[in-house]
């Protein structure tokens, strides 16, 4: 059977054969991959990017969430979606997922001028069906799925938004282990909404294989202040494995070269 | 109270290596990361690396990749410093210091180690 | 990465003087700023955190200000104790980095 794929801190540690980043198949050998290293000052304004908009977002919820053996996942199921921000279309939340280490400087797979951040966070949507605006864009979309990233860094507050997700991964230390967070909103985890209007814009990929080469991302540049604490919970309570020896950190995929994209900025 | 208690001075011979500690007490070790910083006579401060005591993750100065190895033992709160292929620009204090915040200031330091490499 | 610059190398003072060290970061890094004082063969101890928050134990003659590139570290009443070395060190950017230090000397 062929070996499923891994992050590189996986492969250190354990003793099962899997496929680290650079050996990941299906369109992650590809040219237009993510996540790349975004240059502030090369990126050019563009007025079209605007404000989004957002719906369901504040709307309190019992969310299921689970441990996938590669990150934590949120179970979004279509009840909130997003427009504007320079989107062609509204696009429905699927789901929610972070990437971390155990270290400040490192758990982010995007980096602003080269330098990575504590974690990353990923709002994935996709775009709702019947929208495209012609035919090839249906068949073949680089838009399909917008991903909001947002970028996650230290701050001395606890952020109570973030409490029940934090609090819910002692629940789910294994793969495939899944429970039902304390009742909050998706707008509790994001930065004020005046924080929200500064973002780079490129087309990229997924993150994980299959690497599809479909995803419209919004990199906002204002990061998310998490307390210490709440960080490295991630790398304390969760798992790769199911013997647990193996902590779920450094599930960050290598920078990917720009080529010749253009990245844009509110 | 949080205390960092460093091992003490060694004078070593050019080309060895030698393994420095910081014992930490009075605060849970596994939940602040270590730092080390060097500090030559009569000269500022300098970043060797960083290391998180609860799950061994380490962080190096780009200068000092090839130098320093950090460790760290959890069951008596000691964090070490490896340094190797020594020369007389090793010859230092070399601190240990916790960070107050994930990122950010240091709050407690050590007392530090002073190295000389000498034949 | 993000180079600090201290001034001056050297500051003179008569004891019960109000006396001032800047702290220049290459780029703007808000309040990431953090002060330590050092005394001759001993470890640095952090004064001020943020570029002005207090630091329990330290006295109230320390105080920090600034944001952006330029930061302050007063002492509003210089005490033959403070002699020492100051540092500030930028926590903004990995890796972090000190300035060269001021040396604060009695006339």
């Known amino acids: 059977a062929e070996s499923h794929w891994c992050y590189e801190v996986q492969a250190e540690s354990s003793n099962y054969p899997c496929l680290v980043p650079v050996k990941w198949g299906g369109n992650c050998q590809k040219d237009r991959q993510s996540p790349i290293n975004i240059v502030t000052t090369k990126a050019k304004v563009d007025k079209k990017l605007g404000r989004f908009f957002f719906s369901g977002y504040d709307k309190k919820q019992t969310w299921t969430v689970q441990n996938n053996g590669h990150s934590v996942m949120m179970l979004l199921e279509n009840k909130a979606s997003i427009s504007g921000g320079g989107l062609p279309a509204p696009y429905q939340a699927k789901q929610l997922h972070l990437h971390w280490s155990d270290l400040p400087y490192k758990g982010s797979e995007h980096s602003l001028d080269g330098e990575h951040f504590a974690m990353e966070m990923h709002i994935v949507h996709e775009k709702e069906k019947g929208t495209s605006r012609n035919v090839k864009e249906a068949q073949d979309p680089e838009d399909e799925i917008a991903v909001l990233a947002f970028l996650v860094e230290a701050g001395t507050q606890v952020n109570e938004g973030f409490q029940p997700l934090v609090e819910a991964l002692s629940n789910i230390p294994k793969p495939e282990m899944s429970t039902t967070m304390a009742e909050s909103s998706l707008l509790d985890l994001l930065p004020k909404e005046e924080k929200l209007r500064h973002y780079f814009r490129y087309l990229g990929s997924l993150t994980t294989p299959t690497c599809d080469e479909k995803v419209v991302w919004t990199v906002f540049r204002e990061p998310i202040q998490l307390h210490r604490e709440q960080i490295l919970a991630f790398s304390q309570k969760l798992y790769y494995d199911k013997e647990q020896t193996v902590s779920m950190k450094d599930n960050v995929r290598p920078l990917q070269q720009l080529g010749q994209r253009t990245v844009i900025k509110s | 109270d949080v205390q960092l208690v460093e091992s003490g001075a060694e004078l070593v011979r050019p080309g060895t290596s030698m393994k420095m500690s910081c014992k930490a007490s009075?605060?849970?070790?596994?939940?602040?990361?270590i730092e080390w910083i060097k500090q030559r006579p009569g000269q500022g401060l300098e970043w060797i690396g960083v290391?998180?005591?609860?799950?061994?993750?380490?962080h190096y100065n780009e200068k000092f990749k090839d130098k320093a190895t950090l460790t760290a033992d959890k069951s008596s709160s000691t964090a070490y410093m490896q340094l190797s292929s020594l020369t007389s620009d090793d010859s230092a204090v070399y601190f240990c210091?916790?960070?107050?915040?994930?990122?950010?200031?240091?709050?407690?330091w050590g007392q530090g180690t002073t190295l000389t490499v000498s034949s | 990465q993000i180079q600090i610059t201290q001034s001056p190398a050297i500051l003179s003072v008569s004891p019960g003087e109000r006396v001032s060290f800047s702290c220049r970061a290459s780029?703007?890094?808000?309040?990431?700023i953090h002060w330590y004082q050092q005394r001759t063969n001993g470890s640095p101890r952090l004064l001020i955190k943020y570029a002005s928050e207090s630091i329990s134990g330290i006295p109230s003659r320390f105080s920090g200000s600034g944001s952006g590139t330029d930061f302050t570290l007063s002492i509003n009443s210089v005490e033959s104790e403070d002699i020492a070395v100051y540092y500030c060190?930028?926590?903004?950017?990995?890796?972090?980095?000190f300035g060269a230090g001021t040396k604060l000397e009695l006339k």
């Open positions: 290391i998180n005591p609860g799950s061994g993750g380490t």
């Open positions: 210091a916790r960070e107050g915040d994930y990122g950010a200031r240091f709050d407690y």
């Open positions: 060190q930028q926590s903004n950017s990995w890796p972090t980095t």
């Open positions: 780029q703007s890094i808000g309040t990431r």
């Open positions: 009075g605060y849970a070790f596994t939940n602040y990361l």
